[in-house]
Interface confidence: medium
Amino acid sequence: YDFTNCDFEKIKAAYLSTISKDLITYMSGTKSTEFNNTVSCSNRPHCLTEIQSLTFNPTAGCASLAKEMFAMKTKAALAIWCPGYSETQINATQAMKKARKSKVTTNKCLEQVSQLQGLWRRFNRPLLKQQ
């Protein structure tokens, strides 16, 4: 999916109002310096691409993020503010329902959510415009 046409300011507002707090709740008890951020992004569409991948794609050691509160709110925000996003996710959602039975918080998941926090912060950085 190409995130270029999303309403970035609305997604930013959704992140600041709820998603950020849900990410913090998930990471509660974990020191902010425990994980090094290794995933990065250069601009807002790129950040959303990385955020979608880390949030919804199962990875080795962490296959359970899609049912977390922050993931559901992320999906809702993208569905509302990214034209055509919902349609591209129907098949993917069916696959996830079969793959994910239970929510298990592993160290790998904590590391992945730490990466997500970094990506969201980069998504929210003040934009510099060419002058």
């Epitope: 951020n37 912060r121 980069r122 415009k129 060419q130 002058q131």
Partner: antibody
Framework: EVQLVQSGAEVKKPGASVKVSCKAS????????MNWVRQAPGQRLEWMGI????????SYNQKFKGRVTLTVDKSASTAYMELSSLRSEDTAVYYC??????????????WGQGTTVTVSS | EIVLTQSPATLSLSPGERATLSCRAS?????MHWYQQKPGQAPRPWIY???NLASGVPARFSGSGSGTSYTLTISRLEPEDFAVYYC????????FGGGTKVEIK
Amino acid sequence: EVQLVQSGAEVKKPGASVKVSCKASGYTFTDDYMNWVRQAPGQRLEWMGIISPYNGGTSYNQKFKGRVTLTVDKSASTAYMELSSLRSEDTAVYYCAREDYDYDGYAMDYWGQGTTVTVSS
Amino acid sequence: EIVLTQSPATLSLSPGERATLSCRASSSVSYMHWYQQKPGQAPRPWIYATSNLASGVPARFSGSGSGTSYTLTISRLEPEDFAVYYCQQSDSGREFGGGTKVEIK
């Protein structure tokens, strides 16, 4: 390891221009913004401006607007700060500083070693 | 433009004492960063986003505050802590405070 290596000291006459370079290594240059900060002898740190190497977007301290120009060479992973119409009060150490986004609030996590610019007739 | 005012300008204390550095903003800011600078050196990040210690910073340092009032505290001064500390905001531009010099009494 992230490193910012700046060009050497400069001595300029009033009215001239100076261009300071900042070579970045150890990270993806286009992923982070670059700030320029100066410090006159015995004085506070003074923010001059910021540039996005990704798209060349800039934001300047109003005090320097019109006199300072920030640019980048993406292929060389190098940021530049050019200050024109130099006067004696521009004598200072000029720093480049990478801006970190792994923390809320956008802090400057790595700094160059500084470039001393002396303006004297 | 957001103006940051640091106080006191100079803090004269002995090793082992507690140091409290203040930074006030002319209007509310989301976070405050702190940097340490020693003579002839570039500034070093010391505290990120109000209360997160930078890598290698001893636990005797702490940061707190919100809105327009922020504080850096050193619980027990060690010889290597004597330096100048600057606060910095990034809500509007990137402004620094005037600095507080912590010197040996």
